[in-house]
Amino acid sequence: MAVTACQGLGFVVSLIGIAGIIAATCMDQWSTQDLYNNPVTAVFNYQGLWRSCVRESSGFTECRGYFTLLGLPAMLQAVRALMIVGIVLGAIGLLVSIFALKCIRIGSMEDSAKANMTLTSGIMFIVSGLCAIAGVSVFANMLVTNFWMSTANMYTGMGGMVQTVQTRYTFGAALFVGWVAGGLTLIGGVMMCIACRGLAPEETNYKAVSYHASGHSVAYKPGGFKASTGFGSNTKNKKIYDGGARTEDEVQSYPSKHDYV
């Protein structure tokens, strides 16, 4: 039950996170005109990854896309790439995790396959979240660097325009949305990975019985082995003291090398 809850919660948190990453990527307010201690203008400038906008005091807003690809700064291109990679990985992760959900039955899919898929989606969410956080952080660093630079006739770093008036840019809402969304996706991914550890396959219908061969301390199991998932627990027989048969239900589990990805 706890595993299902952890998996479900991880999925929901990741879903919200990826929706946030998509929203942040599409938002125009990655950087906004700094209004503090600046010449007060009757227009408000703000910029996104794809276009820059100007809002006049009347409320009239005009946005212009960055129609050049080669003319854009490498850093902006890198941020775009990171955000898109984050979205793609997140979307694939969501698709995979839907099929991996314990509460959803698809044909005769084994728990081992679900565990595999849960881990895969978890890793995808983690990478997706890291991509978003990295993208937003790179952009924020770019803003901080430009903020302190002399801005008279300076290259704004956005859309290849020359700055003719001292306009400084500060963090826009999209940066905060991106950081939070990236963090949520990361947390969701971690939860999926944790859930994967608890997704042990269902027991076989018959009991595996241990037999003592005379003069040997080795227990022999005729069939009925658990299929190794690569993600679940390794099975190791308990030492048998009473010479009687023990069921696999009593077998202790030990962490495998796959548990710590």
Epitope: A42, N45, S52, V54, F60, V165
Partner: antibody, heavy 120, light 113 residues
Framework: QVQLKQSGAELVRPGASVSLSCKTS????????IHWVKQRSGQGLEWIGR????????YYNENFEGKATLTADRSSSTAYMQLSSLKSDDSAVYFC?????????????WGQGTSVTVSS | DIVMTQSPSSLTVTTGEKVTLSCKSS????????????LTWYQQKSGQPPELLIY???TRESGVPDRFTGSGSGTDFTLTVSSVQAEDLAVYYC?????????FGGGTKLEIK
Amino acid sequence: QVQLKQSGAELVRPGASVSLSCKTSGYIFTSYWIHWVKQRSGQGLEWIGRFYPGTGTAYYNENFEGKATLTADRSSSTAYMQLSSLKSDDSAVYFCTREGYGKGNAMDYWGQGTSVTVSS
Amino acid sequence: DIVMTQSPSSLTVTTGEKVTLSCKSSQSLLNAGNQKNYLTWYQQKSGQPPELLIYWASTRESGVPDRFTGSGSGTDFTLTVSSVQAEDLAVYYCQNDYYFPFTFGGGTKLEIK
């Protein structure tokens, strides 16, 4: 059509206050900035400030801070400017104007002006 | 405050003549975000309130005759009247529409011979 009708001429004593009105019609009053401009006899134009009736936000030219107070009555779509502690150099024609939408903050409609004479 | 300087202060021309009015600002009125200049031209005829002629330095207000043309960028702007008519007798003001407080030039009085 858009119209801005200003109140009649005022003759006031030095040190007194006066309130000028600007009744608007033909557009949504709360969606546009109202500006006030001063023009002394035979001289140029001086921007006093602007007021947004939708939110009650006002911006003033520092030279008129404490001199002019901009307000509005949304129910009657009327903007007001109160001038206090009047002196002789406050004698001028005062215009109310509307800031256009998508016109680079330009003032596209003007009232006919109100003449204020400060004299003892 | 931004200082707007207009020249000449007055100008006498004959009808049909081409006339150029100049306006200079102490700071650039070009906004990098949309590459637009926030400069406006007004025409004020005697005893009347000013009328909007040109905004964004070069966009004609609807109803304004096409003989009026605005040009320039940054700090230097011009208003050109391609063929002056008798009804163009007025004072022309340029205005900074970018920085607060908005400021007007001293005006150029256009007179007809």
